[in-house]
């Protein structure tokens, strides 16, 4: 049966800065086709259990699937198909009119160069360990990859890291993000965001670990010299990080222009698209270069801020210079100044 389980089946994810997330395209017969999210009897707004696409993520050398559902509604110059039958089957597909097709999006974890432990080592009081020390980032349930509370394991001893806001630890955070294969340090996360709020019914393996660590050397260059063991503390902050490799990234699109390469910038928060509001932190063209790249267009030709005379104009706001640094978008409920961007069109 012709499906994404076929060992020779080829797929790719496009319209994003990462090979592990984007719009699903499949190779079928004589070329690449965008898969419509209405395929297999689904509605264009329906989100699927992402584990059904694990074979696709695996083939792309990415990690486990995080989400499978509608990607973005935009003009798509390439061929698009709607498929029928079982999810993931391509035996019965028909060409779709591009304006009827809402493309299917898939987000897989970025690949990790080394595999972190999938389960936490059991809490124990065995003698001091000899196994190499390692780190783990524990995200909120359904949370992001490369964002969460840092746990340090030295052999079978593991726990969180006590952290004081006044600690000058920028070098350490960069070292930790790097060690986790997550890029560089972006910011500290409040514990609620990082997922520390403990659910009383949470399974045993997610209960707080019995060991706690304190930063011993913030300029350390190997893990064994960074932390020392302390008595677990009832109160106080624990180290929670957001690294540049976090996923899924904010997705963008250009709407209302004469081609896919120009229009007002919109971004997606969850399943919702909204206008991206102008931000004083993004006055250079760097942000728009990134947006143009995500649309698979050339570099920025121009960008202009549209007048926000309307106090009811709403949208989303990213406080960073680049969207790829935005771990969360903030809602702006009034005076949202939209931005119209024109990128070079590779296929004029």
């Amino acid at each position: 049966r012709l499906s994404w389980y076929d060992p020779d089946f080829q797929a790719r994810l496009t319209r994003s800065n990462s090979k592990c997330q984007g719009q699903l395209e499949v190779y079928l017969k004589d070329g690449w086709h965008m898969v419509c999210s209405q395929s297999w009897g689904r509605s264009s707004k329906q989100w699927e259990d992402p584990s059904q696409a694990s074979k696709v993520c695996q083939r792309l050398n990415c990690g486990v699937p995080l989400s499978l559902g509608p990607f973005l509604v935009t003009y798509t110059p390439q061929s698009s198909i709607i498929c029928y039958g079982q999810l993931g089957s391509f035996s019965n597909c028909s060409h779709s009119r591009n304006d009827m097709c809402h493309s299917l999006g898939l987000t897989c974890l970025e690949p990790q160069k080394t595999t972190p432990p999938t389960t936490r080592p059991p809490p124990t009081t065995t003698p001091e360990p000899t196994a190499p020390p390692r780190l783990q980032l524990v995200a909120q349930s359904g949370g992001q990859h490369c964002a969460g509370v840092v746990e340090f394991y030295s052999g079978s001893l593991g726990g969180t890291i006590s952290y004081e806001a006044q600690d000058k630890t920028q070098d350490l955070e960069n070292f930790l993000c790097n060690n986790l294969q997550c890029g560089s340090f972006l910011k500290h996360l409040p514990e609620t965001e990082a997922g520390r709020a403990q659910d009383p019914g949470e399974p045993r393996e997610h209960q707080p670990l019995p060991i706690q660590w304190k930063i011993q050397n913030s300029s350390c260059t190997s893990l064994e010299h960074c932390f020392r063991k302390i008595k677990p503390q009832k109160s106080g902050r624990v180290l929670a990080l957001l690294c540049s490799g976090f996923q899924p990234k904010v997705q963008s699109r250009l709407v209302g222009g004469s081609s896919i390469c120009e229009g007002t910038v919109e971004v997606r928060q969850g399943a919702q698209w909204a206008a991206l509001c102008d931000s004083s932190s993004a006055r250079s063209s760097l942000r728009w270069e990134e947006v143009c790249r995500e649309q698979q267009c050339g570099s920025v030709n121009s960008y202009r801020v549209l007048d926000a005379g309307d106090p009811t104009s709403r949208g989303l706001f990213c406080p960073h210079q680049k969207l790829s640094q935005c771990h969360e978008l903030w809602e702006r409920n009034s005076y949202c100044k939209k931005v119209f961007v024109t990128c070079q069109d590779p296929n004029p």
Epitope: R1, L2, D6, D8, Q10, K29, N92
Partner: antibody
């Protein structure tokens, strides 16, 4: 095992129509993902893809020859046919029948070829 | 139409050598490239598809590499039975072939 065998007239005159038949075994054109097509090769020259037909009756033609070509199949008899109209001496070549899967695994099986000479 | 250019019509080699046959696409074809071997009086045989995947039964001395517009078929430890014509083929958009490279003995 997979085999494909071409048959054709051998010699035709310019402006005539060529009819080729490919008879195959070892797979079925009713199986999803299967396709059969035609490629030609003038003596001592390169390969030129002509047309392809798929399990679901979808057909693809070489855009530069599209108006001259018609491909069809009889899946129950394991046969594929190609018609080329308005022949020219430049159509003199060996014509190969090939199998291909929809997942893009190349032309994985080829027939032995049938030679056509177009001459007045 | 995408044009596939094999700049070397002929390449000379010796048994035991390593030889690389190049193929250039006129536009980006991703990794949708296959390689075929054709001996005199025979039909072409598929060697490699999706740039680097060997077809069933193809010896591991044949390897493919590249992406975008530049592709290479490498034969390590050339055997006398490898002397033949080699064609590249792109199938990213329809199907087009290179004009072929003949591998011959020095």
């Amino acid at each position: 095992q997979v085999t494909l065998k071409e048959s054709g007239p051998g010699i035709l005159k310019p402006s005539q129509t060529l009819s080729l038949t490919c008879s195959f075994s070892g797979f079925s054109l009713s199986t999803s993902g299967m396709g059969v097509g035609w490629i030609r090769q003038p003596s001592g020259k390169g390969l030129e893809w002509l047309a392809h037909i798929w399990w679901d009756d979808d057909v693809y033609y070489n855009p530069s020859l599209k108006n001259q070509l018609t491909i069809s199949k009889d899946a129950s008899r394991d046969q594929v046919f190609l018609k080329i109209t308005n022949l020219d001496t430049a159509d003199t070549a060996t014509y190969y029948c090939v199998r291909r899967r929809a997942t893009g695994t190349g032309f994985d099986y080829w027939g032995q070829g049938t030679t056509l000479t177009v001459s007045s | 139409n995408i044009v596939m250019t094999q700049s070397h019509k002929f390449m000379s080699t010796s048994v035991g050598d390593r030889v690389s046959i190049a193929c250039k696409a006129s536009q980006d074809v991703g990794t949708a490239v296959a390689w075929y071997q054709q001996k005199p009086g025979q039909s072409p045989k598929l060697l490699i598809y999706w740039t680097s995947t060997r077809h069933t039964g193809v010896p591991d001395r044949f390897t493919g590499s590249g992406s975008g517009t530049d592709f290479t078929l490498t034969i390590t430890n050339v055997q006398s039975e490898d002397l033949a014509d080699y064609f590249c083929h792109q199938y990213n958009s329809y199907n087009t072939f290179g004009s072929g490279t003949r591998l011959e003995l020095k």
